[in-house]
C-alpha cells in the first residue's frame, strides 16, 4: 500500500490555445487529468489500473502551480495504491480548457483539450522526487513525481504492514524495510520479552519488565542465585531449595543442636582447656589455681596447706607466707631446731632421732601427714572430682559425690538418667530429652513402677490349716505362716507332736 | 491440534468469588509465543475482555476489573486460571478461555467452548 | 478508556457485498482483528493484523484499516456468513472489542 504523488510545478500557454490550434475564449482556464497504470512499452488508451485524478481550474494560459496540502485533489496530487508496488508505470496527463464550471469529461467538448503527455519508465519507492518537463509545440508542462509508501507500510514495494506498538505483544518500532527495531530493554521474535537485570540466574530468576529480577520459588537475592533453606534451618546452609546441610559443629535436622558447645559459647574461664563432650556437653581442665565446672573458682594458694610442722599460712599478692611455731623455720617451716626430747610429733606419732639427736622425723599413724603428725590426711586438695563433683575424706580414702547426670570414681563419666534403675519392680527405663520414662510391667504402674496394681496372691486363700497368708511385694507371691503343727509353703503337713 | 476447556461452578451467590480453570490440550502453555486470555459475553450481549497470562506469570488485566481479577497459569498441569471477586449478577456471563498469538498481532485463534457462570443467590 | 465503535446491524442480498466497519481513535495506527461468532458458538477469528486471513478462511473476507476506520469486507455474501461480527484491538495492554454488528443475508 503507497501513494503515486504527482507535484505540478508551472504550465506555459503563452498563446492561449487548444491542442486543436484554435484559441480559448477569453482564455484557457485550465485544469488537469492524471491516469496512472501499469508498465506499457507505448501508452494507450484504457483502463487507469493504478487510478485517476482530476484537479480544479488551477489558473488560465500560463501559470505557476502553488503548492497546497490540505487535500481535495489539490497540489501534489494523490495516487493511492493498495498492492505490492510493481517498481514500473505508466503516466498520462492532459490538460483541459473549462468553458464552464462543469469539469465532468461528458460535459466537455472534445477539442477542449489542450495537451496530452505520456511518460512510462522504472520508479523506486523513496522520498525523492524526480523532476520532468514535457515540451510540444504550444505549451510546457513542468512536474515532480514520487512513490511513497503509506503509513505503516515499509520495504521496496510497500508490501511489509509493521505498526509501531508498546504492549505486551510487542515492545518495537518499525525499520525502513519493516522489520522490527525492539526498544531498549526488549527483545525476542516480536520484542514482547524483557531483558532482565543483568546476571539474573536463567533458570531461577524471570522478569515481566526490563531491568528486573523476580525469583522462582526455593530462590532469592537480587540474582535469584542464593537458595532458600529448609523453614527453621537455623546453622545451616542449601545448594538447592529447601536443604539444611550443616555448619561446622552443628547437627539435626534444622542444625539446631550445638555439637560444639566449646567454640560457640566459651564456656571455661580463666584460660582452661575446653573439651567438647557430646550435645551441648563439655568438660573444662582447669590451670593450676582455679577450680569449678567453669574454672570459675580462683584457689587460695593456702589451700593446698604449704606450711608444715604447724605453722600458719597468710596469702599475699605474689604467693604466700608461712608463719611457723616455735622451733620451726624455713619457707614452709620444714627445719626443726627440736629433737625427740621435745615430743614433737602430734597425734600419737612416734619419733626417732636422725643425725645423733641433732635432728629428729616423725612415723605417722594412719590418716595423719606432716613433719610432725599435725595435719590430718586430706586427699581432696588435687580436687580430683570432674564435672562439679564434690569431694570428701573418708578417713585414709576419699570419694567423689557427683552432680546429676555424671558418675565414676571422679565423676568423670556422663550417665543417662536410667543408669541409676530407677524404674521398680522390673519396669523398662528409656532415656528421654528431658529426663526418663519407665515402661511398667504387668501389675505395677506410677512414674517409677512403684505403684502396685495386681491381685494380691493372697486373694486365693493359698494357706490351708487356718495359717496367716501375706504377699510378698517384691515376688509378687505369698507366704504362709503356718500354726502350731503344721508345716510346708502351704501348712498342709501335720508334724506329730510330742 | 491445540484445544482449550473451560472448568468450574455453573453457579456462584452473590458477593463470593468466581473461579475457572482453563485445560489446554494438544500443546504446551510455556510456548513463549502466545499469552493466554479470558473473555466473557454477558447473555444477549457483546465481548469483553477481562485479561491474560504469559507462561512466565506475566499479567495483564482490563482497568475495568483490575481490582477484582486473579490470573494465574499452572506450567505443570498445563492450566491457567481465573478468579472474580466479589461478584454480583452483572458478572452473569458465558466465560471463555482464549489463546492469543503473538504472531497474529495478539489475535485470539483458539478459543474454549466457553462455560455459563449464573451470578444468583 | 479507549472505544471502538460498530453498527448494531448491516443487511446485505446473497451473492452482494457486505461492508461493516469499526472505529475508534487512531484506529489505523493498531492492529485491528475481526472475529465472527453464530448463535450458540464460539467466536472464529476471521481478520487479524488488518487484513490478513487465517488458514481455512475463506478469500471473500478481507479487512482494511486506516485512518480512524477498519473495516470488514465480505464479498459474494453467503447465507452462511449471517453471524454477528466483533472488532478487537490493543489498547496499551488492554484488549479492546467493538459492540458487534450483526450481519443479516436477505
Known amino acids: 500500500s503507497g501513494v503515486f504523488q504527482l507535484q505540478l510545478q508551472e504550465f506555459i500557454n503563452e498563446r492561449g490555445v487548444l491542442a486543436s490550434g484554435r484559441p480559448c475564449e477569453p482564455g484557457c482556464r485550465t485544469f488537469f487529468r492524471v491516469c496512472l497504470k501499469h508498465f506499457q512499452a507505448v501508452v494507450s488508451p484504457g483502463p487507469c489500473t493504478f487510478g485517476t485524478v482530476s484537479t480544479p481550474v488551477l489558473g488560465t494560459n500560463s501559470f505557476a502551480v502553488r503548492d497546497d496540502s490540505s487535500g481535495g485533489g489539490r497540489n501534489p496530487l494523490q495516487l493511492p495504491f493498495n498492492f505490492t508496488w510493481p517498481g514500473t508505470f505508466s503516466l498520462i496527463i492532459e490538460a483541459w480548457h473549462a468553458p464552464g464550471d462543469d469539469l465532468r469529461p461528458e460535459a466537455l467538448p472534445p477539442d477542449a483539450l489542450i495537451s496530452k503527455i505520456a511518460i512510462q519508465g522504472s520508479l523506486a519507492v523513496g522520498q525523492n522526487w524526480l523532476l520532468d518537463e514535457q515540451t510540444s509545440t504550444l505549451t510546457r508542462l513542468r512536474y515532480s513525481y514520487r512513490v511513497i509508501c503509506s503509513d505503516n507500510y515499509y520495504g521496496d514495494n510497500c508490501s511489509r504492514l509493521c505498526k509501531k506498538r508498546n504492549d505486551h505483544f510487542g515492545h518495537y518500532v518499525c525499520q525502513p524495510d519493516g522489520n522490527l527495531s525492539c526498544l531498549p530493554g526488549w527483545t525476542g521474535e516480536y520484542c514482547q520479552q524483557p531483558i532482565c537485570l543483568s546476571g539474573c540466574h536463567e533458570q531461577n530468576g524471570y522478569c515481566s519488565k526490563p531491568a528486573e529480577c523476580l525469583c522462582r520459588p526455593g530462590w532469592q537475592g537480587r540474582l535469584c542465585n542464593e537458595c532458600i533453606p529448609h523453614n527453621g534451618c537455623r546453622h545451616g546452609t542449601c545448594s538447592t531449595p529447601w536443604q539444611c546441610t550443616c555448619d561446622e559443629g552443628w547437627g539435626g535436622l534444622f542444625c539446631d543442636q550445638d555439637l560444639n558447645y566449646c567454640t560457640h559459647h566459651s564456656p571455661c574461664k580463666n584460660g582452661a582447656t575446653c573439651s567438647n563432650s557430646g550435645q551441648r556437653s563439655y568438660t573444662c581442665t582447669c590451670r593450676p589455681g582455679y577450680t569449678g565446672v567453669d574454672c570459675e573458682l580462683e584457689l587460695s594458694e593456702c589451700d593446698s596447706n604449704p606450711c608444715r610442722n604447724g605453722g600458719s599460712c597468710k596469702d599475699q599478692e605474689d604467693g604466700y607466707h608461712c608463719l611457723c611455731p616455735p622451733g620451726y623455720y624455713g619457707l614452709h617451716c620444714e627445719h626443726s631446731t627440736l629433737s625427740c626430747a621435745d615430743s614433737p610429733c602430734f597425734n600419737g606419732g612416734s619419733c626417732r632421732e636422725r643425725n645423733q639427736g641433732a635432728n629428729y622425723a616423725c612415723e605417722c599413724p594412719p590418716n595423719f601427714t606432716g613433719s610432725n603428725c599435725e595435719k590430718k590426711v586430706d586427699r581432696c586438695t588435687s580436687n580430683p572430682c570432674a564435672n562439679g563433683g564434690q569431694c570428701l575424706n573418708r578417713g585414709p580414702s576419699r570419694m567423689c559425690r557427683c552432680r546429676p547426670g555424671f558418675t565414676g570414681t571422679y565423676c568423670e563419666l556422663h550417665v543417662s538418667d536410667c543408669a541409676r534403675n530407677p524404674c521398680a519392680h522390673g519396669g523398662t527405663c528409656h532415656d528421654l530429652e528431658n529426663g526418663l520414662m519407665c515402661t511398667c510391667p504387668a501389675g505395677f504402674s506410677g512414674r517409677r513402677c512403684e505403684v502396685r496394681t495386681s491381685i494380691d496372691a493372697c486373694a486365693s486363700s493359698p494357706c490351708f490349716n487356718r495359717a496367716t497368708c501375706y504377699t510378698d511385694l517384691s515376688t509378687d507371691t505369698f507366704v504362709c505362716n503356718c500354726p502350731y503343727g503344721f508345716v510346708g509353703s502351704r501348712c498342709e503337713f501335720p508334724v506329730g507332736l510330742p | 491440534e491445540v484445544q482449550l476447556q473451560e472448568s468450574g461452578p455453573g453457579l456462584v451467590k452473590p458477593s463470593e468469588t468466581l473461579s475457572l480453570t482453563c485445560t489446554v490440550s494438544?500443546?504446551?502453555?510455556?510456548?513463549?509465543?502466545?499469552?493466554w486470555g479470558w473473555i466473557r459475553q454477558p447473555p444477549g450481549k457483546g465481548l469483553e475482555w477481562i485479561g491474560d497470562?504469559?507462561?512466565?506469570?506475566?499479567?495483564y488485566y482490563n482497568p475495568s476489573l483490575k481490582s477484582r481479577v486473579t490470573i494465574s497459569v499452572d506450567t505443570s498441569k498445563n492450566q491457567f486460571s481465573l478468579k472474580l471477586s466479589s461478584v454480583t449478577a452483572a458478572d452473569t456471563a458465558v466465560y471463555y478461555c482464549?489463546?492469543?498469538?503473538?504472531?497474529?498481532?495478539?489475535?485470539?485463534?483458539?478459543w474454549g467452548q466457553g462455560t455459563l457462570v449464573t451470578v444468583s443467590s | 478508556s479507549y472505544e471502538l465503535t460498530q453498527p448494531p446491524s448491516v443487511s446485505v442480498s446473497p451473492g452482494q457485498t457486505a461492508s461493516i466497519t469499526c472505529s475508534g481513535q487512531r484506529l489505523g495506527d493498531k492492529y485491528a482483528s475481526w472475529y465472527q461468532q453464530k448463535p450458540g458458538q464460539s467466536p472464529v477469528l476471521v481478520i487479524y493484523?488488518?487484513?490478513k486471513r487465517p488458514s481455512g478462511i475463506p478469500e471473500r473476507f478481507s479487512g482494511s484499516n486506516s485512518g480512524d476506520t477498519a473495516t470488514l469486507t465480505i464479498s459474494g455474501t453467503q447465507p452462511m456468513d449471517e453471524a454477528d461480527y466483533y472488532c478487537q484491538a490493543w489498547d496499551r495492554d488492554t484488549g479492546v472489542f467493538g459492540g458487534g454488528t450483526k450481519l443479516t443475508v436477505l
Open positions: 482464549a489463546r492469543q498469538a503473538l504472531a497474529l498481532g495478539g489475535g485470539s485463534d483458539k
Open positions: 497470562i504469559y507462561y512466565t506469570g506475566s499479567t
Open positions: 493484523e488488518d487484513s
Open positions: 494438544g500443546g504446551s502453555i510455556s510456548s513463549s509465543s502466545y499469552y
